[in-house]
């Protein structure tokens, strides 16, 4: 995903997970200067901003995801101990200082561990 100011690459657009797993939502970006990175969650239950930060500074994590999210300077985030309700669309927006933006989507499917799966 390329523009004059921002390029964004998402290696894995769909992630399948089971409950209690820690999940890395992996991205790579490049741009001029230090961008603002924002992750938003969208599902049938609604939409909310998860976190916003400039790499190298402290992240502003929403109350709903406090202690559940870890940010990385490459734009990726990790979700800890996911539940079924964490399934949905995770949208990253990278905005450079001059205002150029790119967005990309990762779809997360979280399922229960079925008893049969263990045997």
């Amino acid at each position: 995903l390329q523009s004059q100011g921002v390029s964004l690459y998402i290696p894995q657009a769909t992630i399948n997970a089971t409950v209690k797993e820690d999940i890395l939502l992996s991205v790579e970006y490049s741009c001029h200067g230090v961008p603002t990175i924002e992750w938003t969650y969208s599902s049938n239950w609604g939409t909310q901003k998860i976190v916003e930060w400039k790499p190298g500074t402290q992240a502003n994590i929403s109350q709903s995801h406090k202690d559940r999210v870890c940010t990385f300077d490459n734009g990726s985030i990790q979700l800890f101990s996911v539940g079924v309700r964490d399934s949905g669309y995770y949208v990253i927006t990278v905005t450079e200082r001059l205002g150029s933006s790119q967005f990309g989507t990762i779809v997360l499917h979280v399922s229960e561990i079925l008893y049969e799966d263990l045997h």
Epitope: Q2, I10, S42, T47, Y89, T105, V107
Partner: antibody, heavy 126, light 108 residues
């Protein structure tokens, strides 16, 4: 019914600027993201820009980043596209289109183009 | 950017026949973010399907969509005279949003 009417097209010299407008009616304009799409004569469709419902998020095609600016005035139910430094490659019919909620159920990110205007032709020629 | 390649470029069929149009993506697209449009000469495009398989309002059920990952298909089960047009696929899950080059369905 949903209606989108573009205006502002015409013949413009290379290097000059133009502002296109799209007047919206028949729906709650302020609740929807909006797109601009263009189509060069005899060619396919090219997405140009998107603006979210409150104008907080804007995305552009690579080919127009830095030259085109999308904006909106929700009090006037109008979408705008400012196009600068025009070249002959910009000759096209410009359509405005409403962004359906699609999969998001949410208007801060682009959805499918569920209603289109009739288009406004911009011809760049000296 | 995600490049969408449509095939064939032109499809010559008779009314009543089945039309199968292909759209291939350069990288995976989650099905929720793929749409199909129809455009007739001199007219604006019209949304047919979104989320790969959901018909837009007022679209007849002879239009259906399927596929996942990188391969998507639009099927018109029985062509009506008004279905002869150009069809575009489009993805809206990543910026920049992109269209395929189009498939023209013409009367044989």
């Amino acid at each position: 019914q949903v209606q989108l009417v573009e205006s502002g097209g015409g013949v413009v010299q290379p290097g000059r600027s133009r502002r296109l407008s799209c007047a919206a009616s028949g729906f709650a304009f302020r609740n929807y993201g909006m797109h601009w799409v263009r189509q060069a004569p005899g060619k396919g469709l090219e997405w140009v820009a998107f603006i979210s419902q409150n104008g907080g998020k804007k995305y552009y095609a690579d080919s127009v980043t830095g030259r085109f600016t999308v904006s909106r005035d929700n009090s006037k139910n109008t979408l705008y596209l400012q196009i600068n430094s025009l070249t002959t490659d910009d000759t096209a019919v410009f359509y405005c289109a409403r962004s359906g909620s699609g999969s998001w159920g949410y208007s801060d990110f682009p959805g499918p183009f569920d209603h289109w205007g009739q288009g406004s032709l911009v011809t760049v020629s000296s | 950017e995600i490049v969408l390649t449509q095939s064939p470029g032109t499809l010559s069929l008779s009314p009543g026949e089945r039309a199968t149009l292909s759209c291939r993506a350069s990288q995976n697209i989650f099905i929720s973010f793929l749409a199909w449009y129809q455009q007739k000469p001199g007219q604006a495009p019209r949304l047919l399907l979104y989320g790969a398989s959901n018909r837009a309002t007022g679209i007849p059920d002879r239009f259906s969509g399927s596929g996942s990952g990188t391969d998507f298909t639009l099927t018109i089960s029985r062509l009506e005279p008004e279905d002869f047009a150009v069809y575009y696929c489009q993805q809206y899950g990543s910026s920049p949003l992109t269209f395929g080059g189009g498939t023209k369905v013409e009367i044989k």
